[in-house]
């Protein structure tokens, strides 16, 4: 039993980011006379919190007018709550003196702040890579509390499990970060992919904050080339193709050269998509045989996506008497890389 | 239940110390402050000074370079010593608990005297 | 240092009647919203008995014909109706600053 006591009937209370916190005080005698002031934290460091006679604590109001005789009841609630007011609160009752000295204190009451996460940042490599090859995605999300969270990846619905994954900081924090790393191994199909960052917290009510990336920025898919060339025309033109197919992004230069000598240069530009979110171009060049002595060699070159150029050449050999008109050419591969056209 | 005696010699000599004991039963001296008071015969009330649950003390200013409150908690006991005292200082001594006065001891009669 | 100056300095009164006493400041005892003033009753031989705490507030056991009001620099305690053992000394008290003080004291004598 003691003259007074100073009652903080919570232990702890908690309370989401942005509304009020209530936290409890009761005296149980108003003698000695003296003031009550709130801190935050014990021992010489402790934060004043509020202190009826003076100061400026907009955030801070008594739920019961301090002023009203006979009150017993210096409960506070402080408004606008984030994590940076977590803590243990300390109602302490004072003794009127030169200084005030400190008669008795309470408990002390834990608040904790239930702060949402950030909506989870999916960041992708910096640089794009093959199929076959492992590229990694970073999701990060910030300022929650308390400290237990769940982050899962998915890749197209199903849950990848070549994850690390950190919360920071270890120790106790007002709010924590989380940051976890996934490999994925990319595939010709991913363009039209996607990751998925799933992030659950107490204060989400099992509604899951999501951050997504789109594996169209991270993969490139090379493309296959392929050249022909149609029937001998009657002006003695001959149409050669080049077939560039599957490839992705868009992003492409092609460039014919005959026998060495840039013939034209052309970009992609506004092509269909394929289904599988690739694109296909055909470029054609006229050659006219009847211009050239000597066999031409040509050339395809593309260089997609700021990469080495990948070449196609054949040569047009160049017949002593002009072939008849509508006749069919026989083609004949010389090489991966070369094709003779009689 | 609460109870407080005062106890101490009946008459002291001019310029020696009074010395009273104050012992207390029913509430811890840890918990609440022990208040001295006095009464002249036929006068009113003179608070001496207090002792409180945490053994820091007030005095009465007009009193304060003569008077020493001290306790024993683990008998009980409140002290109280007032030097150099006179025959203004014949009273009727009284502990009282707490800063509401709210238990009184009998009071034990001191008189200064030669 | 805060005086009492209280007011009859002895009062006769018929039983059934009411008494008043007064208890004047020379500051103000107001601290936190309350008034830290106190009334006791003393009868000869014994030690005060208080009646009254924080101006207006009954202490346990003490019946209700006793109340107090008042605030800042005056006060009032009265009796009502009076009864025979009302007779005593009546002593008003501030904690509010140190020393703490008592009020000269009112002599109530029953009729």
């Known amino acids: 039993e003691e003259e007074l006591q100073v009652i903080q009937p919570e232990k702890s209370v908690s309370v989401a980011a942005g509304d009020s916190a209530t936290l409890n005080c009761t005296v149980s005698s108003l003698i000695p006379v003296g003031p009550i002031q709130w801190f935050r934290g014990a021992g010489p460091g402790r934060e004043l919190i509020y202190n009826l006679k003076e100061g400026h604590f907009p955030r801070v109001t008594p739920v019961s007018d301090p002023t009203k005789r006979n009150n017993m009841d210096f409960s506070i609630r402080i408004s606008n709550i984030t994590p940076a007011d977590a803590g243990t609160y300390y109602c302490v009752k004072f003794r009127k003196g030169s200084p005030d000295v400190e008669l008795k204190s309470g408990a002390g009451t834990e608040l904790s702040v239930r702060a949402k996460p950030s909506a989870p940042v999916v960041s992708g490599p910096a640089v794009r890579a093959t199929a076959e090859h492992t590229v990694s995605f970073t999701c990060e999300s910030h300022g929650f509390s308390p400290r237990d969270i769940t982050l899962k990846w998915f890749k197209n619905g199903n849950e990848l499990s070549d994850v690390q994954t950190n919360v920071d900081p270890a120790g106790k924090s007002v709010s924590y970060s989380i940051r976890s790393t996934a490999r994925v191994v990319l595939t010709r199909r991913d363009v039209h992919s996607q990751v998925i960052c799933e992030v659950a917290h107490v204060t989400l009510q099992g509604d899951p904050l999501r951050g997504t990336a789109n594996l169209s920025e991270a993969i490139r898919v090379p493309p296959f080339l392929e050249v022909t060339q149609q029937s001998m025309r009657a002006d003695n033109q001959v149409n050669v193709t080049c077939q560039v197919t599957k490839f992705y992004p868009q992003r492409l230069q092609l460039t014919w050269l005959e026998n060495g000598n840039v013939s034209r240069t052309e970009m992609a530009s506004a092509l269909p998509e394929n289904k599988d979110g690739t694109y296909n171009w055909t470029s054609w060049l006229l050659v006219n045989v009847s211009a050239h002595r000597d066999d031409v060699k040509l050339t395809c070159q593309v260089e997609h996506d700021g990469q080495p150029a990948v070449n196609k050449s054949f040569s047009v050999k160049v017949s002593a008497h002009p072939k008849e008109q509508g006749s069919n050419t026989a083609a004949e591969n010389t090489g991966t890389n070369e094709r003779n056209i009689y | 239940q609460v109870q407080l005696q005062e106890s101490g010699p009946g008459l002291v000599k001019p310029s020696q110390t009074l010395s009273l004991t104050c012992t207390v039963s029913?509430?811890?001296?840890?918990?609440?402050?022990v208040n001295w008071i006095r009464q002249p015969p036929g006068k009113g009330l003179e608070w001496i000074g207090i002792?409180?649950?945490?053994?820091?003390?007030d005095y009465n200013a007009a009193l304060k370079s003569r008077v020493t409150i001290s306790k024993d908690t683990s008998k009980n006991q409140v002290f109280l010593k007032l030097s150099s005292v006179t025959a203004a200082d014949t009273a009727v001594y009284y502990c009282?608990?707490?800063?509401?006065?709210?238990?009184w001891g009998q009071g034990t009669t001191v008189t200064v005297s030669s | 240092d805060i005086v009492l100056t209280q007011s009859p300095a002895s009062l006769a009164v018929s039983p059934g009647q009411r008494a008043t006493i007064t208890c004047r400041a020379s500051?103000?005892?107001?601290?936190?919203?309350?008034?830290?003033m106190h009334w006791y009753q003393q009868k000869p031989g014994q030690p005060p008995k208080p009646l009254i705490y924080?101006?207006?507030n009954l202490e346990s056991g003490v019946p209700a014909r006793f109340s107090g009001s008042g605030s800042g620099t005056d006060f009032t305690l009265t009796i009502n109706p009076v009864e025979a053992n009302d007779a005593a000394n009546y002593y008003c008290?501030?904690?509010?600053?140190?020393?703490?003080?008592f009020g000269g004291g009112t002599k109530v004598e029953i009729k």
């Open positions: 009282a608990r707490a800063g509401k006065m709210d238990y």
């Open positions: 029913g509430f811890s001296l840890t918990g609440y402050g």
């Open positions: 002792i409180w649950g945490d053994a820091s003390t």
């Open positions: 500051e103000s005892v107001d601290s936190y919203g309350n008034s830290f």
């Open positions: 924080l101006a207006s």
């Open positions: 008290q501030q904690n509010n600053e140190y020393p703490w003080t």
